[in-house]
């Protein structure tokens, strides 16, 4: 009774197509698969950024797999062949592992890479990234930003840099068609006559860095003798009403401060007849139904009612 063995896949490699972190893992079938012609061979692929605690594991029948990685670190991957039990009249057979690594050879001391990179997708319409130059770099150092997301043929360079003292310190992006809900990859590299500059890689999803415009058209309506309804409208732009959370800050007679978080464009406030002044402001943020994270908008303009019977008047700013 001969033991069934299978070879690992051949030519296992990680290929960088120049997409700033979106890499291809590819391989060829193992040698001597002739005995298993009737079998569908599977492959178990494990991969991770070097330094990560956990491996991602994929089982596939294909000869390739694609995923995003952090190119600030190296990547390690391993793969083996799986023969299902149907092929072996018994238990599943696994080959030994084939292993490979990939990294971008760095240049420059880490301090030379950009500092405090910050990207905001204003009102789900305009992406703006800003950074500070690396520590100790001279004014002849210039940084260049490249970006890619699925749908672009190749990585693109920023065409509208924000400058300070002749140095690029940010990028205003053009309209980014069909760019949300997918990984957005950025590389900021640099050059200097004086010394080599370390590149930095960043990955995020645009819907998670949205900063909306503040709400508009704040109004008061007396609902009853002890209730006032506060209302406002969503700001202009592409963000639908269902995507907003709001935070309200209400000040009564310059003393009581009420803060509340609500999911729609109204809030009912209990008041007393003695209330002489009422002011409120609202800000908005994309909610968990539309993103994993977000940035609060600026506060709206303040809307106040002062010294008049709210039952007789509705204020509209």
């Amino acid at each position: 009774d001969t033991e069934i063995k299978v070879n690992p896949p051949q030519d296992f490699e990680i290929v960088d197509p120049g997409y700033l972190g979106y890499l291809y893992l590819q391989w060829q079938p193992p040698l001597s698969l002739d005995h298993f012609k009737e079998c569908t061979v599977e492959y178990e692929l494990k991969y991770r950024n070097i330094g990560s605690e956990t491996w991602k594991t994929i089982i596939t029948k294909n000869l390739h797999y694609k995923d995003g990685f952090d190119l600030n670190k190296g990547i390690e991957a391993k793969i083996h062949t799986l023969l299902p039990w149907q092929c072996t009249n018994g238990s599943e057979v696994q080959s030994s592992w084939a292993e490979t690594t990939y990294w971008i050879s760095p240049q420059g001391i880490p301090e030379t890479k950009v500092q405090d990179m910050d990207c905001v997708y204003y009102n789900w319409q305009y992406l703006l990234c800003s950074w500070k130059p690396g520590i100790g770099v001279l004014l002849d150092t210039n940084y260049n930003l490249f970006y890619w997301y699925e749908g672009l043929d190749h990585a693109l360079q920023c065409v509208d840099y924000i400058k300070a003292d002749g140095q690029n310190i940010g990028c205003r992006f053009p309209y980014l068609e069909a760019s949300d809900y997918k990984d957005f990859y950025i590389c900021v590299n640099g050059s200097s006559e004086n010394k080599p500059i370390r590149s930095s890689y960043f990955t995020f999803q645009l819907q998670n860095i949205v900063k909306p415009l503040p709400p508009v058209y704040l109004t008061f309506t007396r609902e009853s003798s002890c209730e006032i309804k506060l209302k406002w409208s969503i700001p202009l732009g592409p963000i639908p009403a269902r995507c907003f959370d709001y935070e309200i800050e209400i000040r009564e007679d310059d003393t009581t401060l009420v803060t509340a978080t609500v999911e729609n464009e109204t809030y009912t406030l209990k008041t007393t007849n003695e209330t002489r002044q009422l002011c409120f402001v609202v800000r908005s943020k994309v909610n968990i139904y539309c993103s994993d994270d977000g940035i609060w908008s600026e506060w709206s303009d303040k809307q106040c009612w002062e010294g008049e019977d709210l039952s007789k008047k509705t204020l509209l700013r």
């Epitope: 330094g51 670190k73 050879s105 240049q107 301090e111 080599p196």
Partner: antibody
């Protein structure tokens, strides 16, 4: 197996120049940077400089005017060149491989004595 | 330059004893770029702990590292004879790259 091996003149007269070679095997100089570090007898380690995989260099500013690091990828060799040597340059000189911002392999070192 | 101050300069420990040595930086260093090397007499340094807390290949699990900002430490949970050596901390964050003056650990 990764190996780095330094070779130098051993003894150099003051005010002279020196060249120390670091010959590597088991990896490619097109994928890893090489650092130079020295250690005077019984003293601290001092970083001299690095030549990156792409060929660019960084030097310790305190020694920059006297230092130069070059390499020959095809021969797997890196050279540290240093001029105007003084007795304070007497030290063990090491080359070390850069791997993800640390020195993961070191050579055994070569002793340099600056003396008349 | 970032100055790394190691304390104590020399220490001795008995077999099985817990050992801790510290490395204080003159300005903040990212934990990704703070490493420890072990050196024995007549040998070149060896990478021992990288990025503050990751053990290099072949380093016994009794070693550990921790810290952030300007304060870092290396700990041996139970001293063994082969641990007697000098340990250097090293910052790779800013140029020039610098090393501490070392902590010499002797067997009592």
């Amino acid at each position: 197996e990764v190996k780095l091996e330094e070779s130098g003149p051993g003894l150099v007269a003051p005010s002279q120049s020196l060249s120390i070679a670091c010959t590597v095997s088991g990896f490619s100089l097109t994928r890893h940077g090489i650092h130079w570090v020295r250690q005077p007898p019984g003293k601290n380690l001092e970083w001299l400089g690095v030549i990156w995989a792409g060929g660019s260099t960084n030097y310790n500013s305190a020694l920059m005017s006297r230092l130069s690091i070059i390499k020959d990828n095809s021969k797997s060799q890196v050279f540290l060149k240093m001029n105007s040597l003084q007795t304070v340059d007497t030290a063990m000189y090491y080359c070390a491989r850069d791997h993800f911002d640390s020195f993961d392999y070191w050579g055994q070192g070569t002793t340099l004595t600056v003396s008349s | 330059d970032i100055v790394l101050t190691q304390t104590p300069a020399i220490m001795s420990a008995s077999l099985g004893e817990r050992v801790t040595m510290t490395c204080t930086a003159s300005s903040s260093v990212s934990s990704s770029y703070l490493h420890w090397y072990q050196q024995k007499p007549g040998s070149s340094p060896k990478l021992w702990i990288y990025s503050t807390s990751n053990l290099a290949s072949g380093v016994p699990l009794r070693f550990s590292g921790s810290g952030s900002g300007t304060s870092y430490s290396l700990t041996i949970s139970s001293m063994e004879a082969e641990d007697a050596a000098t340990y250097y901390c090293h910052q790779y964050h800013r140029s020039p790259l610098t090393f501490g003056a070392g902590t010499k650990l002797e067997l009592k």
